[in-house]
Amino acid sequence: YKLVCYYTSWSQYREGDGSCFPDALDRFLCTHIIYSFANISNDHIDTWEWNDVTLYGMLNTLKNRNPNLKTLLSVGGWNFGSQRFSKIASNTQSRRTFIKSVPPFLRTHGFDGLDLAWLYPGRRDKQHFTTLIKEMKAEFIKEAQPGKKQLLLSAALSAGKVTIDSSYDIAKISQHLDFISIMTYDFHGAWRGTTGHHSPLFRGQEDASPDRFSNTDYAVGYMLRLGAPASKLVMGIPTFGRSFTLASSETGVGAPISGPGIPGRFTKEAGTLAYYEICDFLRGATVHRILGQQVPYATKGNQWVGYDDQESVKSKVQYLKDRQLAGAMVWALDLDDFQGSFCGQDLRFPLTNAIKDALAAT
């Protein structure tokens, strides 16, 4: 099985024990590590952070001791903006320039492939996204002709039904991608006005969301029905939680909220907590399991957080094995307890290690 793990370059800027550099990563933990994100500048792939080149080097030296490790560079992301991607993909010359710029950039920095993180193609971009993937793959095939190992091509896709329908021609893009990471998280957010888990495995009777689509099981099944081969589908598991501020004394699933949860001490983003911040939060909190959804949430005061723990990730891995998927994807290594100092287990990357162990279990 694949264990595809994202690392985010901006995690270096978190304060104190939250600061994560690629040399803190475990070279034997994941089969693939994806560095997020690269930029596109004037139609050419490029660095984003001032010290990306140094960080690329840190990441890719992990392969010196584990030659089986593959590294990819993810291009795009939330801050890149869908419109910018759209302009490049829809213009033949821009698309060509971008595609031609990718292999030398990846080879220069020692990456084994490219991950496309266009979040998200619009309805009018669907065909252009397919073309971009098809042409990028063709370039990788030609570029490998002189006996080089062919560069890998993957994409991170939304797990939301509405986005899947409008953005992706799943059957066509699956032909050209080496694997597809389905982002089976962020199903539920503060916009709903109530508490709810952002990454439930199943719908469950407790699901207060107005549809039956906002869960991992539906998203995976839908992708498979649309023609994604199970052998290419990698299922996303978050090492972060989504938090809410309760608006009343109600604390269950579907309780009213006044907005996102308070920012974490390190991640500093309202409504989001890294797993290592959740471990802190759990001291003195009340933990509940949403039985049907097979995921936990915790409450403390007026704060509510839905997250994944070692038990829930094992359930998710069992599920992906039952469906014969290619493996698991983790967002993100730097949100796990990468130092092993927060979650009291004396173990670095406890969630990702639990995923790895479950994937290896017979």
Epitope: N39, N42, H44, K100, P146
Partner: antibody, heavy 118, light 110 residues
Framework: QSVEESGGGLVKPEGSLTLTCTAS?????????MCWVRQAPGKGLEWIGC???????TYYASWVNGRFTISKASSTTVTLQMTSLTAADTATYFC????????????WGPGTLVTVSS | ALVMTQTPASVSAAVAGTVTIKCQAS??????LAWYQQKPGQPPKLLIY???ILASGVSSRLKGSRSGTEYTLTISDLECADAATYYC????????????FGGGTEVVVK
């Protein structure tokens, strides 16, 4: 691994000239760039243009204005056709090879001198 | 068209000293910048590509860096062999930008 220019010499104003760049010792690579750069006596380097070996795409500096044409003559040779030459085109013309713009030109020929004079 | 403005035109420094050469791009070119060294009667030699990566066989006394659209080449612990003209070059080969060179900086080592 080397590149070498040939075809330089004296040419009259408004005349034409074709320079040839020959690459040798390189293992096969799908995509690389063969480019032309010139340097007037005592002056700096000036980029003329490039051809992408992979698909034959050509790129030119805006000042070229169609007077110069870069083309692939064979798997190892590239030509620079120059027309409507003036005294301002007098320079040493270098051929340079690089795997991409990102990686710069890592192989240069010794240069060939073109003199435009009546 | 893209213009690469290189400063200073000439710089003089003593052996074991340090020189800094700057190159200002008129538009953003990201990390697509290379530095070359040229000695009289010779073709240019690639020193640095991708803003900061040393080409094969180039001394670690050379360092490339960037701040926005300003690029810097620093040569420390100067040697007599460093006396040459240095050029920056944009690494975009498309016709919108062209692989424009800076005007060059002559380094004199005393």
């Amino acid at each position: 691994q080397s590149v070498e220019e040939s075809g330089g010499g004296l040419v009259k104003p408004e005349g034409s000239l074709t320079l040839t760049c020959t690459a040798s010792g390189f293992s096969f690579s799908y995509r690389y760039y063969m480019c032309w750069v010139r340097q007037a006596p005592g002056k700096g380097l000036e980029w003329i243009g490039c051809i992408d070996n992979g698909d034959g795409d050509t790129y030119y500096a805006s000042w070229v204005n169609g007077r110069f044409t870069i083309s692939k003559a064979s798997s190892t040779t590239v030509t620079l056709q120059m027309t409507s030459l003036t005294a301002a085109d007098t320079a040493t013309y270098f051929c340079a090879r690089g795997s991409s713009g990102y990686n710069g030109f890592n192989f240069w020929g010794p240069g060939t001198l073109v003199t435009v004079s009546s | 068209a893209l213009v690469m403005t290189q400063t200073p035109a000439s710089v003089s420094a003593a052996v074991a000293g340090t020189v800094t050469i700057k190159c200002q791009a008129s538009q953003s070119i990201g990390s697509y910048l290379a530095w070359y060294q040229q000695k009289p009667g010779q073709p240019p030699k690639l020193l640095i590509y991708a803003t900061s990566i040393l080409a094969s066989g180039v001394s670690s006394r050379l360092k490339g860096s960037r701040s926005g659209t300003e690029y810097t080449l620093t040569i420390s612990d100067l040697e007599c062999a460093d006396a040459a003209t240095y050029y920056c070059q944009c690494g975009y080969y498309d016709s919108n930008y062209g692989g424009a060179f800076g005007g060059g900086t002559e380094v004199v080592v005393k």
